[in-house]
Interface confidence: low
């Protein structure tokens, strides 16, 4: 999916108002310095591409993020504020429902969510028009 035409300011508002808090809740009890940020992004569409990938694509050692509160709110924000996004995700969602069985918070998942926090921070870094 091409995130170029998303309403970035609305997504930013969704992140600041709720998604960020859910990410912090997920990471509660983890030191902020425990994981190094190794994933980055160069512009807002790129950031959303990386955020989508880390949030919804199962990885080795962490297959259980898609049903977390922050993930569901992320999906809702993208569906509302990115034209045509929800249509592209129908097949992926159905496949995910078949695959997902139980919630397991692994160290790998914590690391992945730490990367997500970094990507979201990158997405939300101050714009000049807001200085």
């Amino acid at each position: 999916y091409d995130f170029t035409n998303c309403d970035f300011e609305k997504i930013k508002a969704a992140y600041l108002s709720t998604i960020s808090k859910d990410l912090i809740t997920y990471m509660s009890g983890t030191k902020s310095t425990e994981f190094n940020n190794t994933v980055s992004c160069s512009n807002r569409p790129h950031c959303l591409t990386e955020i989508q990938s880390l949030t919804f694509n199962p990885t080795a050692g962490c297959a259980s993020l898609a049903k977390e509160m922050f993930a569901m709110k992320t999906k809702a924000a993208l569906a509302i504020w990115c034209p045509g996004y929800s249509e592209t995700q129908i097949n992926a969602t159905q496949a995910m429902k078949k695959r997902r069985k139980r919630k397991v918070t692994t160290n790998k998942c914590l690391e992945q969510v730490s990367q997500l926090q970094g990507l979201w921070r990158r997405f939300n870094r101050p714009l000049l028009k807001q200085q």
């Epitope: 190094n36 512009n43 870094r125 101050p126």
Partner: antibody
């Protein structure tokens, strides 16, 4: 008002070392990725390197010509950015600017620059 | 390595429109920024993110970016616009890349 003030420049012999400082004020320094950019006399701008904010791990990246010789650090408690320059070469002669990065990888605030001259 | 190419100099008559180009491979896929630098002074950001203007920069300054060329347009050029102009973009390998600079002369 955002302000960046560099200091520490001067004349140094080839192979020598120098440490530049950049004092920041007027914004939350710790939130920003900070950079050094240089400009040789009569030449264009050249990116030297940057240090990310602590929330983004505080890691550094450098341009190829200075990698292994220059080290960027920051002291968020003092709102200060540093550039440690070792094994200086004559081609490092330039005005060194510190700059604040905003979104899109652009530099919205620059210091006035400090001149480093490497000459025997 | 990624390179940005600018003309060494551009001339414009007072009150006319100046266009400064910045060429790079598929530059349209990157955000491009433009800086104005007057002699003995630090650079000043005049356009960021292809076409966004920082507060305090006149509406006469605008930018565009597509394909292999980004363009800084200065309408109704004034004597005070005389300066060196640099384009800049971020590259995944070379990080932050500047063009060689263009000297704008207002006739």
């Amino acid at each position: 008002e955002v302000q960046l003030v560099e200091s520490g420049g001067g004349l140094v012999k080839p192979g020598g070392s120098l440490r530049l400082s950049c004092a920041a004020s007027g914004f939350t320094f710790s939130d920003y990725w900070m950079h050094w950019v240089r400009q040789a006399p009569g030449k264009g701008l050249e990116w030297v390197g940057h240090i990310k904010s602590k929330t983004d791990a505080g890691t550094t990246d450098y341009a190829a010509p200075v990698k292994g010789r220059f080290t960027i650090s920051r002291d968020d408690s003092k709102n200060t950015l540093y550039l440690q320059m070792n094994s200086l070469k004559t081609e490092d002669t330039a005005v060194y600017y510190c700059a604040r990065e905003i979104y899109y990888y652009a530099f919205d605030s620059w210091g006035q620059g400090t001149l480093v001259t490497v000459s025997s | 390595s990624y390179e940005l190419t600018q003309p060494l100099s551009v001339s414009v008559a007072l009150g006319q429109t100046a266009r400064i180009t910045c060429s790079g491979d598929n530059i349209g896929s990157k955000y491009v920024h433009w800086y104005q630098q007057k002699p003995g002074q630090a650079p000043v950001l005049v356009i960021y993110g292809d076409n966004e203007r920082p507060s305090g920069i006149p509406e006469r300054f605008s930018g565009s970016n597509s394909g292999n060329t980004a363009t800084l347009t200065i309408s109704r050029a004034q004597a005070g616009d005389e300066a060196d102009y640099y384009c800049q973009a971020a590259d995944w390998v070379d990080f932050y890349v500047f063009g060689g600079g263009t000297k704008l002369t207002v006739l």
